[in-house]
């Protein structure tokens, strides 16, 4: 009679993560008597996957009933496959012995490859805000995919970016892989509404790539432009001065009026108007009683935006333009946009 052969008909099996893998194995003879065992890997460091004699195998089931006398089908199913299950599986026939069973014949092996989807890409930007014309870096990470081949693209508002570097780790063989990419983006004043998108394409995604996004509103700081103007005289001894704070982002802004270098009023931007590009405008008024001044007045609008060093714009009030010097000793009463004044 011909010597027993262990046949593993499939050289390779490809399974998606979470699914069940069937590893086929048949023997050509019932002799010699002895159990079958399944191993992952070969040599002394192999891992025992299934033992016909004993053991507890929550994820492994046999295809046929191995207790039947004439059974020669030793195929197994492994459930809930993960990338960690990848490897070459050997079906090995043992000959009954004393005290130990002796390895008799091994199958040629079946390579189990696991296709695992990449995790949703996570995009993160710089820790601190940056101003227009500066270049900032964004990172994109995705993990747990297999096989290693993967494509990553960057977009800003739908336009593909070219300035980025991507690494897939580890370099050698692994059960699963991670991708890490860093893109450089030049900010513009119009970027408050802009989005940076990292797009990952993988064989497991069937042409429907995964995307991670970052809003540049979290990254950009657009500093304000200031304009101080003198309004027409409201009363003979009163002048209305406005400070227009334009095109700033984010909203966090504090304004201080100085009269000849002395703090007159400090206020925080509240009722702002939003521009189409996402930046904000704000206006503050200062009502000046010129009759209280003998000399010209230097009015300064000083703005501290988003914790940055203050910027300021000044305006010189010519007192000589107002001949009447009468009324209150109070030099100025500053008012917010609600024009609350005490006159």
């Amino acid at each position: 009679e011909e010597e027993l052969q262990v046949i593993q008909p499939d050289k390779s099996v490809l399974v998606a993560a979470g699914e069940t893998a069937t590893l086929r194995c048949t023997a050509t003879s019932l002799i010699p008597v002895g159990p079958i065992q399944w191993f992952r890997g070969a040599g002394p460091g192999r891992e025992l996957i299934y033992n016909q004699k004993e053991g507890h195998f929550p994820r492994v089931t046999t295809v046929s009933d191995l207790t039947k006398r004439n059974n020669m089908d030793f195929s197994i199913r492994i459930g809930n496959i993960t990338p960690a299950d990848a490897g070459t599986y050997y079906c090995v026939k043992f000959r009954k012995g004393s005290p130990d069973d002796v390895e008799f014949k091994s199958g040629a092996g079946t390579e189990l490859s696991v296709r695992a989807k990449p995790s949703a890409p996570v995009v993160s930007g710089p820790a601190a805000r940056a101003t227009p014309q500066h270049t900032v870096s964004f990172t994109c990470e995705s993990h747990g995919f297999s096989p290693r081949d993967i494509t990553l693209k960057w977009f800003k508002n739908g336009n593909e970016l070219s300035d980025f570097q991507t690494n897939v780790d580890p370099v050698g063989e692994s059960v699963s892989y991670s991708i890490h990419s860093t893109a450089k983006v030049v900010l513009t004043r119009e970027d408050v509404h802009s989005q940076v998108i990292c797009e990952v394409a993988h064989v497991t995604l069937q042409g429907d790539p995964l995307r991670g996004t970052a809003n540049l509103s979290e990254t950009i700081r657009v500093p304000p432009t200031l304009e101080v103007t003198q309004q027409p005289v409201r009363a003979e001894n009163q002048v209305n001065v406005t400070c227009q704070v334009r095109k700033f982002y984010p909203q966090r802004l504090q304004l201080t009026w100085l009269e000849n270098g002395n703090v007159s009023r400090t206020e925080t931007a509240s009722t702002v108007t939003e521009n189409k590009d996402g930046t904000y405008n704000w206006m503050s008024w200062l009502l000046v009683n010129v009759s209280a001044h003998r000399d010209d007045v230097k009015l300064t609008c000083q703005v501290e935006h988003d914790g940055q060093p203050a910027v300021s714009k000044s305006h010189d009030l010519k007192v000589s333009a107002h001949p009447k010097e009468q009324g209150s000793n109070t030099a100025a009463e500053n008012t917010g946009s609600n024009e609350r004044n005490i006159y």
Partner: nanobody
Framework: QVQLQESGGGVVQAGDSLGLSCVAS????????MGWFRQAPGKEREFVAG????????YYADSMKGRFTISRDNAKNLVYLQMNSLKPEDTAVYYC?????????????????WGQGTQVTVSS
């Protein structure tokens, strides 16, 4: 060289549960088959449970089947033994063991590395 350190032992009442942990260092944990053994006073060390390197296959001594569960976390280099419905005869020093090769309940012969042990006492 592999270092093994058990923890979680203590004194419990019969019928209670107890969980033992063993942390391994010094070698790639996912290349080691792991096991638990115990030694009661005046008795030989006996096999309790074993688990293959990926955790796919597990082995239990007959008297522990259904009461004890072995598991592992390769990311944390940990192997666990959850013991339920404890009996006074489970009183022993419990040892963690690591093997470079593993053939089911042949594990006692194959174990290359042993921990110092942790005492479990079950009072009636």
């Amino acid at each position: 060289q592999v270092q093994l350190q058990e923890s979680g032992g203590g004194v419990v009442q019969a019928g209670d549960s107890l969980g033992l942990s063993c942390v391994a260092s010094g070698r790639t944990f996912s290349s080691l088959d792991m096991g638990w053994f115990r030694q009661a006073p005046g008795k030989e060390r006996e096999f309790v449970a074993g688990i293959s390197r990926s955790g796919i296959s597990q082995y239990y001594a007959d008297s522990m089947k259904g009461r004890f569960t072995i598991s592992r976390d390769n990311a944390k280099n940990l192997v666990y033994l959850q013991m339920n419905s404890l009996k006074p005869e489970d009183t022993a020093v419990y040892y963690c063991a690591a093997a470079l090769t593993f053939r089911g309940s042949d594990l006692p012969r194959d174990s290359n590395y042993w921990g110092q042990g942790t005492q479990v006492t079950v009072s009636s």
